[in-house]
């Protein structure tokens, strides 16, 4: 018979004949022959192959490097890779989450508009008139200036976007 030029799904062409691919989780040891089937072997510990394949080596599971702010979200199997995610307080640098960075803090004069998540960074906003932030924080919003009037006090020092007002006693009129 005429040697094949194309093979069925889950097969590959080698030496003018169609051999079965190895199933996910297994690697190729030897190609099939006229008389023998394709020989495959399961991937070892911490290895995987996620497709029907003719790979002679399995891939190492991804290492979730804590130096890059990563931790294991889902342990890999012989057919799937490990899935990494960010440590608490870190967020991914891209959709694929190959590394993470620490959430940014909002500087004094800025407050947190939106707290960071595992996929998005802190969003800061400048403290408007009447509000202040005197700390660098990834959580704190701008605080309103103290209302001296409600405490029966007067403003001795005006507030800024970085400092609260300073209240003091009212000057008493002498008799």
């Amino acid at each position: 018979p005429e040697p094949p030029t194309a093979c069925r799904e889950k097969q590959y062409l080698i030496n003018s004949q169609c051999c079965s691919l190895c199933q996910p989780g297994q690697k190729l040891v030897s190609d099939c022959t006229e008389f023998t089937e394709t020989e495959c072997l399961p991937c070892g510990e911490s290895e995987f192959l996620d497709t029907w394949n003719r790979e002679t080596h399995c891939h190492q599971h991804k290492y979730c490097d804590p130096n890059l702010g990563l931790r294991v979200q889902q342990k890999g199997t012989s057919e799937t890779d490990t899935i990494c995610t960010c440590e608490e307080g870190w967020h991914c640098t891209s959709e694929a989450c190959e590394s993470c960075v620490l959430h940014r803090s909002c500087s004094p004069g800025f407050g947190v508009k939106q707290i960071a998540t595992g996929v998005s960074d802190t969003i800061c906003e400048p403290c408007p008139v009447g509000f202040f932030s005197n700390v660098s924080s990834a959580f704190e919003k701008c605080h309103p200036w103290t209302s001296c009037e409600t405490k029966d006090l007067v403003v001795q020092q005006a507030g800024t976007n970085k400092t609260d007002v300073v209240c003091g006693p009212q000057d008493r009129l002498r008799a």
Epitope: K62, G69, S94, E95, S99
Partner: antibody, heavy 116, light 108 residues
Framework: EVTLKESGPVLVKPTETLTLTCTVS????????VSWIRQPPGKALEWLAG???????YYASWAKSRLTISRDTNLKQVVLTMTNMDPVDTATYYC??????????WGQGTLVTVSS | AFQLTQSPSSLSASVGDRVTITCQAS??????LAWYQQKPGKPPKLLIV???NLASGVPSRFSGSGSGTDFTLTISSLQPEDFATYYC??????????FGGGTKVEIK
Amino acid sequence: EVTLKESGPVLVKPTETLTLTCTVSGFSLSSYGVSWIRQPPGKALEWLAGIGSDGSAYYASWAKSRLTISRDTNLKQVVLTMTNMDPVDTATYYCARGGITVYAMWGQGTLVTVSS
Amino acid sequence: AFQLTQSPSSLSASVGDRVTITCQASQSISSGLAWYQQKPGKPPKLLIVGASNLASGVPSRFSGSGSGTDFTLTISSLQPEDFATYYCQSYFSSSSTVFGGGTKVEIK
């Protein structure tokens, strides 16, 4: 063993399009991204483009209009095309494992000269 | 556009010297900074990730510090094999994935 190997033309004429291929082994393109970084002779490294393990493409803002990055996970290849080549694009072009991240694994690089 | 400014561009030092290289980002990149060493004709080698964490197999004489916009690479006692060019790289986001201009460390 993880390897990355760049291939493509050694010489390109001005205004032509450069096509470079990075062939990887020892890891899956479904698990790791790949980036292209270049280095003109005697000059600094320049990040050009990256493709994430999810297939998302990223480009350096200064070269975005000239670049296209794509991948074939079955062939284990990542392809970069750069249009309208100029003599200032003469450089060693590297591919490295990773998208928007750090690059612990690099290819040996391929020198591309742009000259008429 | 986002920029990473590295200084000095070159320096001369002797074996045993303490060497410091700085890298400044034009906007905050949190801890998203790496350092590389490159020797002529070779691809760069990763030294530091996350601004201060030593990459696998890197000698402890190398250290990194900083966060936000200002970063430093220090070689505590320069060895003969450390004469090379050093680069910082930011990876905070796709719009800020950039290399610094490099610092060439030469023999005095």
